[in-house]
């Protein structure tokens, strides 16, 4: 059996291997092997055949026994050494370096902008529904329901600051107590961690890269879920956050201050405002129970308007309703009074794409969601590739050492805390934990940052986003100052409590172990990553919310047995792991259960079966797209999948042996040797390791 079970029968036809790859593969790309075009058996390699969904070399790559997939990869510089280059080569190299750096900044800018647009898209698609979750006050007094509302709303609007500002408004207008708002804030904290998990999905092309990226992203999720798991019952029992924040507010007499500097927004807003502008007040009005807001569009049409206060004659039901007794009369039919009416006069329309389209919010939302995800994915691929080509040799060594090395003994323990401060500082600068953690995800994926270092950076990011909220609260008007400050402080102390729980003692750094476990599963069964995302961020919160609607007895009746079962499984797992001897023989493993209950293999088979049905149709489309791209790019070496052909047709084409050229930008280790020999002198760009792997989903 292979050391990586996911590689067993990696193809629908196990007997059909990539030519010239039948033996155990080394992880060094074929480019680096100056060997003649023969395989291990000495047979000449004619060409490489790409097979559907499993066409990358990475899938048949077997890790030598004893290697840890979590070890950071060596990013070797395969290019010509600096000393060996002539003046022209050096100049070209400098220009290339500067060009790559500019491109990197450009893609990073587009990446951040697409995250902003993605948030707007989510608000257009689910913002009104999210607002309605908040308007059900009776449910929100239940802390568990409050928690899931916080999760759902933040997932739907892709912005914890939006959900926080709704909560602040509701507390300020006495629609919600601070006690009821705390679980919602906890939920918002969980909801905000979905963004970098979505970003991690974009790196599914390479199993090991995906393993690291997904673990790096979900370490945030696990920290938040585990913190809530401990702190929500604690808060429900003791109200420590409410008491502590009250104490802080009474001890320090807070004055209105300046808001946090919006450094990133200043750069991204000019671009994102050309794409879409939203009227965030609409969601807030819906949450506050304003039924009229339901029919309003979230898309901002007018950006400049003036407010005129004019005296207007308005009808009232009777003279008792007159605003001023001296200004009240009847015309014999209606009773009138004079009122100061504030009229908004629109002057200038906004300058975004959708301003003149009378499309419904949902349609615009879906368009933007699609476009922003495509741009996000594209930018991520390009960032990963550019970083891969830049971070090599000396540069990689220096960066990796700087980021992942601890302080010398006895101060090694301080490194993590410094990372927390760095994470908090960076988040404070960019004003968004989502942006910071999402930008960090590809770096974890390519192995520049280790999971162990990403964890404190993420925790710091959580702190950073709350300090931003505190500053925003200090800048809020007098009537909402106290409530917004108390909620921001609750958020802050919740994260501090979480850090105290899951960071100081290495043994308690459970989120790292859980994230690595999930990373391993997701690398083996990539569909599980999508399942995890849907299950934990949508299905579970929606189920809990539905049960909350039914009332406490139903929620407890269904929830308690499930929790007890989970605890039982957990205890049994611990005993199996720690001291199996005390267990009866049958309980020492999970084999007493049907396979589908303790293994993902049967589920994987079902999903593989389902995806294969779509694959034939999908591959035809992919091949056409691939060919068009090759033609447009004028690529040198491009092979397009033949997965939708019949066996006979494939054989025919094999005989013809017409390779299609593809650009080096999309290097594929499984490509034919004739492509790989070209451009040996170039600095090797990190392989995308077969785009076709993304079809695993």
């Amino acid at each position: 059996m292979a050391p990586w079970p996911e590689l067993e029968n990696a193809q629908p036809n196990p007997g059909k291997f990539i030519e010239g790859a039948s033996g155990p593969q080394s992880s060094i790309p074929a480019k680096d092997k100056e060997a003649s075009k023969t395989n291990d058996n000495g047979t000449p390699v004619a060409k490489t055949e790409l097979l559907p969904s499993y066409s990358a070399l990475v899938l048949i790559e077997e890790h030598p026994e004893g290697t840890d997939p979590w070890d950071l990869p060596e990013l070797q510089d395969t290019g010509i050494k600096w000393s060996e280059r002539d003046t022209k080569g050096k100049t070209l190299c400098i220009f290339q370096g500067v060009g790559k750096f500019i491109l990197l900044l450009g893609f990073l800018y587009l990446f951040v902008c697409s995250l902003d647009v993605l948030s707007s898209a989510f608000q257009l698609v689910g913002g009104k529904v999210a607002g309605q979750f908040f308007s059900n006050n009776s449910i929100m007094s239940n802390p568990v329901a409050g928690l899931v509302i916080g999760v759902l709303v933040t997932v739907m609007v892709q912005s914890s600051s939006t959900s926080s500002s709704i909560i602040v408004s509701m507390v300020a207008s006495s629609l919600l107590t601070v006690r009821a708002a705390i679980p919602i804030i906890m939920g918002a904290n969980i909801g905000t961690s979905i963004t970098n998990t979505i970003v991690a999905l974009m790196q599914a092309g390479d199993r090991n890269e995906f393993r690291r990226a997904f673990a790096g992203a979900t370490v945030h999720d696990f920290f938040n879920w585990l913190s809530v798991f401990v702190l929500l019952p604690l808060e429900a029992a003791t109200h420590y956050l409410e008491i502590l924040t009250n104490l802080v507010l009474e001890t320090f007499k807070f004055q209105n201050g300046e808001d946090a500097p919006d450094i990133l927004k200043v750069i991204t807003d000019p671009f994102t405002k050309l794409i879409i502008q939203l009227d965030k007040k609409v969601i807030q009005q819906i949450a506050m129970g304003d039924s009229a807001a339901q029919n309003k569009s979230l898309i901002k049409i007018w950006c400049k308007s003036i407010t005129n206060v004019t005296e207007m004659n308005v009808t009232v039901p009777s003279t008792d309703n007159c605003t001023s007794p001296s200004y009240c009369w009847t015309d014999g039919i209606q009773t009138w009074t004079i009122q100061n009416v504030t009229q908004k006069e629109n002057i200038a329309k906004c300058q975004h794409i959708f301003v003149n389209f009378s499309l419904p919010d949902l349609a615009v939302g879906i368009i933007l969601l699609t476009v922003s995800l495509v741009v996000l994915c594209g930018c991520l691929i390009m960032i990963v590739k550019l970083l891969g080509s830049v971070l090599r040799g000396q540069v990689a060594t220096v960066i990796k050492k700087t980021l992942n090395t601890d302080f010398p003994f006895p101060f090694a323990w301080l490194t993590g805390y410094l990372a927390i401060l760095v994470g908090a500082g960076m988040t404070f600068i960019v004003q968004s934990s989502s942006v910071f953690t999402s930008a960090m995800t590809p770096l974890i994926g390519i192995g520049v940052i280790s999971i162990e270092r990403a964890y404190p950076l993420t925790l710091g990011s959580n702190i950073g986003t709350t300090t931003t909220a505190i500053l925003a609260a200090l800048a809020s008007p007098g009537n909402t100052l106290r409530s917004s400050l108390q909620i921001a402080l609750c958020h802050f102390f919740f994260n501090i409590s979480g850090i105290l729980l899951w960071y100081p003692i290495p043994f308690t750094r459970l989120p790292i172990r859980l994230a690595k476990g999930l990373g391993n599963i997701s690398a083996k069964y990539r569909w599980f990553a999508v399942f995890y995302l849907i299950f934990f961020f949508f299905v579970t919160p929606l189920t809990v919310f539905g049960l909350s609607l039914a009332g406490w007895p139903v929620l407890v009746g269904v929830g308690v047995p499930i929790i007890l079962l989970l605890l039982l499984v957990l205890c049994l797992r611990m005993l199996q792991f720690r001291c199996p001897r005390i267990l009866p023989l049958k309980l020492r493993d999970w084999n007493f259960l049907p396979l589908w209950m303790h293994s993902l293999k049967p589920w994987d088979n079902v999903i593989s079966l389902a995806t294969t049905c779509f694959q034939r149709r999908c591959c035809c489309c992919c091949r056409v797209c691939c060919r068009v791209c090759c033609m447009v790019c004028g690529c040198k070496c491009c092979r397009c999948s033949k997965c939708c052909r019949d066996q006979g047709e494939e054989e025919e084409e094999k005989e013809q042996d017409i390779p299609v050229k593809a650009s080096g930008a999309f290097d594929n280790a499984a490509m034919s040797k004739e492509c790989q020999d070209e451009g040996k002198g170039q600095v090797e760009v990190l392989s995308m390791k077969a785009l076709s792997n993304t079809t695993v989903f």
């Epitope: 009808t315 007794p325 001296s326 009369w329 009847t330 015309d331 014999g332 039919i333 009773t335 009138w336």
Partner: antibody, heavy 120, light 107 residues
């Protein structure tokens, strides 16, 4: 100029009905309320009711409800008042008057009046 | 219904004299009071609305004042064409109600 021209004098028998018209010109009919006021010989003015021609909303004085019907024809800018179950005490001069809708300027223009005599 | 009482019911004056007609409402009507002039054999004409606002084309000798329950119409210098019956009307609440009228004559 603003004009409210009423129909001619009517002589009616008790128990019958009378329909008085008020044709307007010189202003936007739908922007005003048309009121009907009567004046018995040697007496003061008594308000009967009013109609908003724009939406046909009406209001009547309590003691006329059920006996009076106010209507308006926007196409001809004409208002009508029909009074049924006539009694001798309904003998009076009936006036139509306009009142600017949503304004407190009172009845700023009146018709010339229609004399309705009820006798057996 | 709001009752409107007018006094005097009639008065005789000389050209150039100052004449004051009073109107009392049975309850507070704010300033929702209008004054009308009706010459013999003619239809009424609006003089004053909102207690003190002169209607367009009304001579300046006619002034209205008051608020709450007590209102007055003053003709600062009576002219021969001012011979008429003057009515006050409240329009604070429905139904609209009129005073019985004050008949002004010239000696």
């Amino acid at each position: 100029q603003v004009q409210l021209v009423q129909s001619g004098a009517e002589v009616k028998k008790p128990g019958s009905s009378v329909k008085v018209s008020c044709k307007t010109s010189g202003f936007f009919f739908t922007e005003y309320i048309i009121h009907w006021v009567r004046q018995a010989p040697g007496q003061g003015l008594e308000w009967i009711g009013g109609i908003i021609p724009n939406n046909d909303v009406t209001n009547y004085k309590q003691n006329f409800r059920g006996r009076v019907t106010l209507t308006a024809d926007k196409s001809t800018s004409t208002a009508y008042m029909e009074l049924s179950s006539l009694r001798s005490e309904d003998t009076a001069v009936y006036y139509c008057a306009r009142w600017r809708n949503a304004y407190y300027s009172a009845m700023d223009s009146w018709g010339q009046g229609t004399t309705v005599t009820v006798s057996s | 219904d709001i009752q409107v009482t007018q006094s005097p019911s009639s008065l005789s004056t000389s050209v150039g004299d100052r004449v004051t007609i009073t109107c009392t409402a049975s309850q507070d009507v704010g300033t929702a009071v209008a004054w009308y002039q009706q010459k013999p054999g003619k239809s009424p004409k609006l003089l004053i609305y909102w207690a003190s606002t002169r209607h367009t084309g009304v001579p300046e000798r006619f002034t209205g004042s008051g608020s709450g329950t007590d209102f007055t119409l003053t003709i600062s210098s009576v002219q021969p064409e001012d011979v008429a019956t003057y009515f006050c009307q409240q329009y604070r609440t429905s139904p609209l109600t009129f005073g019985v009228g004050t008949k002004v004559e010239i000696k």
